[in-house]
Interface confidence: low
Amino acid sequence: VPGEAEQPAPELVEVEVGSTALLKCGLSQSQGNLSHVDWFSVHKEKRTLIFRVRQGQGQSEPGEYEQRLSLQDRGATLALTQVTPQDERIFLCQGKRPRSQEYRIQLRVYKAPEEPNIQVNPLGIPVNSKEPEEVATCVGRNGYPIPQVIWYKNGRPLKEEKNRVHIQSSQTVESSGLYTLQSILKAQLVKEDKDAQFYCELNYRLPSGNHMKESREVTVPVFYPTEKVWLEVEPVGMLKEGDRVEIRCLADGNPPPHFSISKQNPSTREAEEETTNDNGVLVLEPARKEHSGRYECQGLDLDTMISLLSEPQELLVNYVSDVRVSPAAPERQEGSSLTLTCEAESSQDLEFQWLREETGQVLERGPVLQLHDLKREAGGGYRCVASVPSIPGLNRTQLVNVAIFGPPWMAFKERKVWVKENMVLNLSCEASGHPRPTISWNVNGTASEQDQDPQRVLSTLNVLVTPELLETGVECTASNDLGKNTSILFLELVNLTTLTPDSNTTTGLSTSTASPHTRANSTSTERKLPEPESRG
């Protein structure tokens, strides 16, 4: 009405769907008597009387609010229960005396939407599409008012970008008055989006403030052409014979092309296709030096029939050839000299070492080992090791046996063996020499002889302990073309005092073999008190 003062802004009352709204009539005593008030709802500028207060007593008017209104706070407040979205409107109270005044209340209604449901485009998106394609659809059900949708890619909000990103939102009103929101994210994706995580977020307000609910994260299949194929070799680094080597073809396209791996024939220089496993991997196990060469991968896009070739990759399977030692079977007289030479080929620089076989002692670093003034102890095994220092584990070895001419040499000269009468005694006797000696025993028994190495022999005798044997003892004799030598085993009966040896002796029932190299003594299955070894 012209000339009438502008109405003050209505008081704002905020409430969630389903709860009770308390509409407090803000008329002062001067503006009207609260014991005589009419309440109206205003919808589309039409007032509807919904409640009367007379002498402090309330009475609902027939209609949509009839069952949900009641008076509180000594008549000053109207309670509206089970609030619905349709209740979002202005309510006003009007006092009747002394003059008609009104107080307006704006009721705002809120309802948090359900958790957003996101569905990714299962068909995927090609990167070369001419316009934005559907990436995913987000649905937020039963919210009020309409929630705001924000789309995220990798945790960052996506904003409208002309011809690149488009967010298409629509909403439907349910019979409850709540909104269901559907938002479609359309985008032109690039290859880098293949791992991108997309999700939608519903922003909504409640009386308590702003809130948000997030959907799960999804990735969309992104299809992009292969631009590059390449070979990958495992393990990375220097390869050696015996390794398990895998050569695989990789591409930067999705889906990947059909792969084939070829190796250049060194003779014809033609590429020859290799047989790969079901996964398209060429497995070389064990790798050999013949596997060295130039490999390349071909990727064939079965849709476009476009073929791409990788950069060729040189594969080097490092090797060490068989090691050759000269002379191969050296024989020398005592006092003479010997030069042993080691040779091998490799794809890398070699390092040579000479080791004494029996002790593992390094004698020489280099391919040539010189031995002077040879003693009979110098006889035995010498090992040449050819190794590639830059590739751990890549080495080959060759053992050569040096023979020193000489008569038999006994592991021990004489030995005491503790026995019990009528037991079967297991005796052993070892000798070395060149030519390799044979061993004989001075008593009857079951003897067996085994060659330990080209210059060494071990003989074992099983014999019954008799009084005569205790009397005579046992002798073993080793013979070759250059002479003979004998070891004596004295047999002594075990008694209680011998079972308590002093600090200078040891006892044992184990069987062991005495040899010039191990410095062990003659053995018996009975306890023995060994003596210091003597060499014949």
Partner: antibody
Framework: QLQLQESGPRLVQPSGTLSLTCVVS?????????WSWVRQPPGEGLEWIGE???????TYKPSLKSRVSMTVDTSKNQFSLNLTSVTAADTAVYYC????????????WGQGTLVTVSS | YELTQPPSVSVSPGQTASITCSGD??????ASWYQQKPGQSPVLVIY???KRPSGIPERFSGSNSGNTATLTISGTQAMDEADYYC??????????FGTGTKLTVL
């Protein structure tokens, strides 16, 4: 080299409207960047006001939302800020800035212009 | 949403300066750092927690986890004396700047 240059009245009356323009040179305003306004009252810290996209989409700081509007003019390669109902509390150096693509930070800034609200 | 910084930090030349920025679950957001010298515009020195724009010396580094982001300047130089602001973003708070820290190189 991308450059941003703010321009507009340096003195605004209380309850009036502050209007600033940022001219972008060295790059197109239609690149996938958001263009922001940030202010700094004398001797105080930085405060983000809002941002605008070349499509016209905007985001404003909630506490300023009722007073702010931003627009883009792609033909002139520039964007603008309007702040209504200003008070002395709006006195500040106003910067325009570019948000880096794919990151929530500002990689290019204008040199800033001091706007004083006073009668 | 608020980001709190110490008002001032002092450091001797050649030493390491650390400026912190605290905010509720700040580690869940990207933090950026700006250097501002008197009378000049801010300059981005760290973005996305720890990345350095081209042209920014390697002595500037950043980290962000939990409720705290940290800007570290190793081998601080006199030219590093300036105000430093952290900044974070998320969907509900949008852009928020820290209160600012004055770095003094003694």
């Amino acid at each position: 080299q991308l450059q941003l240059q703010e321009s507009g009245p340096r003195l605004v009356q209380p309850s009036g409207t502050l209007s600033l323009t940022c001219v972008v040179s060295g790059a197109s305003i239609t690149t996938p960047n958001w263009w922001s306004w940030v202010r700094q009252p004398p001797g105080e810290g930085l405060e983000w006001i809002g941002e605008v996209y070349h499509s016209g989409s905007t985001t404003y700081k909630p506490s300023l939302k009722s007073r702010v509007s931003m627009t883009v003019d792609t033909s002139k390669n520039q964007f603008s800020l309007n702040l209504t109902s200003v008070t002395a509390a709006d006195t500040a150096v106003y910067y325009c800035a570019r948000e880096a693509v794919g990151a929530a930070d500002f990689d290019y800034w204008g040199q800033g212009t001091l706007v004083t609200v006073s009668s | 949403y608020e980001l709190t910084q110490p008002p001032s930090v002092s450091v001797s030349p050649g030493q390491t300066a650390s400026i912190t920025c605290s905010g509720d679950k700040l580690g869940d957001k990207y933090a950026s750092w700006y250097q501002q010298k008197p009378g000049q515009s801010p300059v981005l020195v760290i973005y996305q927690d720890s990345k350095r724009p081209s042209g920014i010396p390697e002595r500037f580094s950043g980290s962000n986890s939990g409720n705290t982001a940290t800007l570290t300047i190793s081998g601080t130089q006199a030219m590093d004396e300036a105000d430093y602001y952290c900044q974070a973003w998320d969907s509900s708070t949008l852009y928020v700047f820290g209160t600012g820290t004055k770095l003094t190189v003694l």
